[in-house]
Interface confidence: low
């Protein structure tokens, strides 16, 4: 005779387990039916009666066969910066994902807990790494010979047009302006856009070469006269020679004058000094800054004032995005304990017209015994953007999300706690602050 099929509830054979979609009730000591997804156990089984299941109440769910006394609550409604990709039903939780132009700053097992707007690179900066569903845009200064004149989360640095005769030299935020003859480009013209509906599979290309550590001048001359455009005539050698000559002479005079002044003022052998003019800060912001004579400029302890955004976040969900800790403006604590000077100004309060800050960095390098020859001077002045947000180091770090750290820029933060830093290189000379604007 075939073995009789046992109907729930039944006492299992010694050493055997209950069947699929059944559970062992310790009280009744019987195998009882589980409730199907979308239901929960209203009445637990006894020796004589099976589990009584009931449908989940509104806004609750169970995704698995279960014997829970209450269904799980669906997550709260998706926020305005999110899209509901899966609705709350009796069998599934709501899933919220970030809408286009935003990325997930704090993910959870399914969907996103917190979205943040993709950073926009301001003029003079291009996209080094595009944003994805889970990472922000990384901006970088445009290298010599390239520029970006837009505030965008997709535009990369584009090459300057190459002129036969330069009317206005290009810089990091402006293309070269040519005189009336037709220009040529080292690459295809037009703004280069990265794909905007960001995807986790987007390629992290490096569209432009990394900026060199060599100082870049604010007047970029063409490498040499390019051959005249086909069909055009005229002798360009003379004006180009004049421009080059006059510029070189001017530079030489400035350099000589500068070194003479320095030798008169300082009277130091082998002048190799760096001066950083730090903008006047209120007392509370100036704490921790040290004199310009020190080798390590501006060192402060990292701020630990930011509150935990969600202390109840599970260990699985505590994946923080690649952002740095909020610290005193202009300071970045690095792993090796060294400091990086920054010219980033702090954000202005929402709706306000924050103070603009001029930061000038003058670097003098003299390497001769009589202190007057072989001198070069470099000055770069940047106007701090009143609404620039903290800049991002291109390094892709995973920062643990503790109570002392802020995973993203939220409205809980005051502008004063936000960090500004240029790059992972110790003060690239002549490179303005790596300013980014939030969307």
């Amino acid at each position: 005779l075939p073995a009789q099929v046992a109907f729930t509830p039944y006492a299992p054979e010694p050493g055997s387990t209950c069947r699929l979609r059944e559970y062992y009730d310790q009280t009744a000591q019987m195998c009882c039916s589980k409730c199907s997804p979308g239901q929960h156990a209203k009445v637990f089984c006894t020796k004589t009666s099976d589990t009584v299941c009931d449908s989940c109440e509104d806004s609750t769910y169970t995704q698995l066969w279960n014997w829970v006394p209450e269904c799980l609550s669906c997550g709260s409604r998706c926020s305005s910066d999110q899209v509901e990709t899966q609705a709350c039903t009796r069998e599934q939780n709501r899933i919220c994902t970030c809408r286009p132009g935003w990325y997930c700053a704090l993910s959870k097992q399914e969907g996103c807990r917190l979205c943040a707007p993709l950073r926009k690179c301001r003029p003079g900066f291009g996209v080094a790494r595009p944003g994805t569903e889970t990472s922000d845009v990384v901006c970088k200064p445009c290298a010599p010979g390239t520029f970006s004149n837009t505030t965008s989360s997709t535009d990369i640095c584009r090459p300057h047009q190459i002129c036969n005769v330069v009317a206005i030299p290009g810089n990091a935020s402006m293309d070269a302006v040519c005189t009336s003859t037709s220009p040529t480009r080292s690459m295809a013209p037009g703004a280069v856009h990265l794909p905007q509906p960001v995807s986790t599979r987007s390629q992290h290309t490096q569209p432009t070469p990394e900026p060199s550590t060599a100082p870049s001048t604010s007047f970029l001359l063409p490498m040499g006269p390019s051959p005249p455009a086909e069909g055009s005539t005229g002798d360009f050698a003379l004006p180009v020679g004049l421009i080059v000559g006059v510029t070189a002479l001017g530079l030489l005079i400035i350099g000589v004058v500068n070194c003479v002044i320095m030798t008169q003022v300082k009277k130091k052998p082998l002048c190799l000094q760096r001066e950083a003019k730090v903008p006047h800060l209120p007392a509370d912001k100036a704490r921790g800054t040290q004199g310009p004579e020190q080798q390590h400029l501006l060192i402060t302890a990292p701020s630990s004032s930011s509150s935990s955004l969600e202390s109840s976040a599970s260990a699985l969900d505590r994946r923080a995005p690649t952002r740095n800790q909020p610290q005193a403006p202009g300071v970045e604590a690095s792993g090796a304990g060294e400091a990086r000077a920054s010219t980033g100004s702090s954000d202005s309060s929402p709706g306000g017209h924050g103070t603009q800050v001029n930061v000038t960095c003058i670097v003098n390098v003299c390497s001769s015994s009589d202190h007057s020859s072989q001198c070069s001077s470099q000055a770069s002045s940047t106007m701090g953007d009143t609404d620039s947000s903290p800049s991002e180091s291109p390094k892709d770090e995973q920062v643990p999300f503790s109570k002392e750290e802020c995973a993203f820029r939220s409205q809980l933060e005051t502008p004063e706690t936000l960090l500004g830093s240029t790059e992972e290189k110790p003060l690239p000379l002549g490179v303005p602050d790596a300013g980014m604007k939030p969307s």
Epitope: S36, C56, C74, T89, R94
Partner: antibody
């Protein structure tokens, strides 16, 4: 006595936009889910969409882009963007029993008498 | 997604007889199913919700059963007044569905 009343149904030519309005009496419409259902002559019931008390809206897959549901504090509107002859039907405004699911309701417990929309050239 | 199929499309029943109408969901809808009665020239009227709960004022000769994907409406001791078209409707989700309603079953009372 709780009642629902639809208005705005009329004879229109194809391509004409039309707005139907649902008004409640005896209860506050704003605390309930409100669905629009239509019925072509001699055919079955066809669900168009629902607006929840919190303002979220769900449409039938075929109705997306063809109809827009909106609400004020006292009425719920159904706007048809560009009607065709196939949209000729009686349009019912229906109350969904309060439930706080984002995507559903328990039952449609109160129906209006319906308003006839005829689309003909 | 969540298509509702009603059978039969039409049924004839004698007064005092019993009629059974079936409704099948293409996916599980737990017990979130309602039944409506619609008489000619009138709007539909709620009979049963949550598969088996009788709406107020509905005679006890109407009963509903089922869970998951298979549901049944039974009218016992059919009266002349029961001649109507009956619709099932899933109340499980309104997300990404074509129609909440089944195609309807016409009940003709002889």
């Amino acid at each position: 006595q709780e009642q629902l009343k639809e208005s705005g149904g009329r004879l229109v030519t194809p391509g004409t936009p039309l707005t139907l309005t649902c008004t409640a009496s005896g209860f506050s419409l704003s605390s309930y889910y409100v669905s629009w259902v239509r019925q072509a002559p001699g055919k079955g019931l066809e669900w168009i969409g629902i607006i929840h008390s919190d303002g979220s809206i769900y449409y039938a897959t075929w109705a997306k882009g063809l109809f827009t549901i909106s609400r004020t504090s006292t009425t719920v509107d159904l706007k048809a963007t560009s009607l065709t002859t196939e949209d000729t039907a009686t349009y019912f405004c229906v109350r969904g029993y309060p439930g706080y699911y984002t995507s559903t309701f328990n039952r449609l417990d109160l129906w209006g008498q319906g308003t006839l929309v005829t689309v003909s050239s | 997604a969540y298509d509702m199929t009603q059978t039969p499309a039409s049924v004839e029943v004698a007064v005092g007889g019993t009629v059974t109408i079936k409704c099948q969901a293409s996916q599980t809808i737990s017990n979130e199913l309602s039944w409506y009665q619609q008489k000619s020239g009138q709007p539909p009227k709620l009979l049963i919700y949550r598969a088996s709960t009788l709406a107020s004022g509905v005679p006890s000769r109407f009963s509903g059963s089922g869970s998951g994907t298979e549901f049944t409406l039974t009218i016992s001791g059919v009266e002349c007044d029961d001649a109507a078209t009956y619709y099932c409707q899933q109340g499980y989700t309104t997300n990404n569905v074509d129609n909440l309603f089944g195609g309807g079953t016409e009940v003709v009372v002889k």
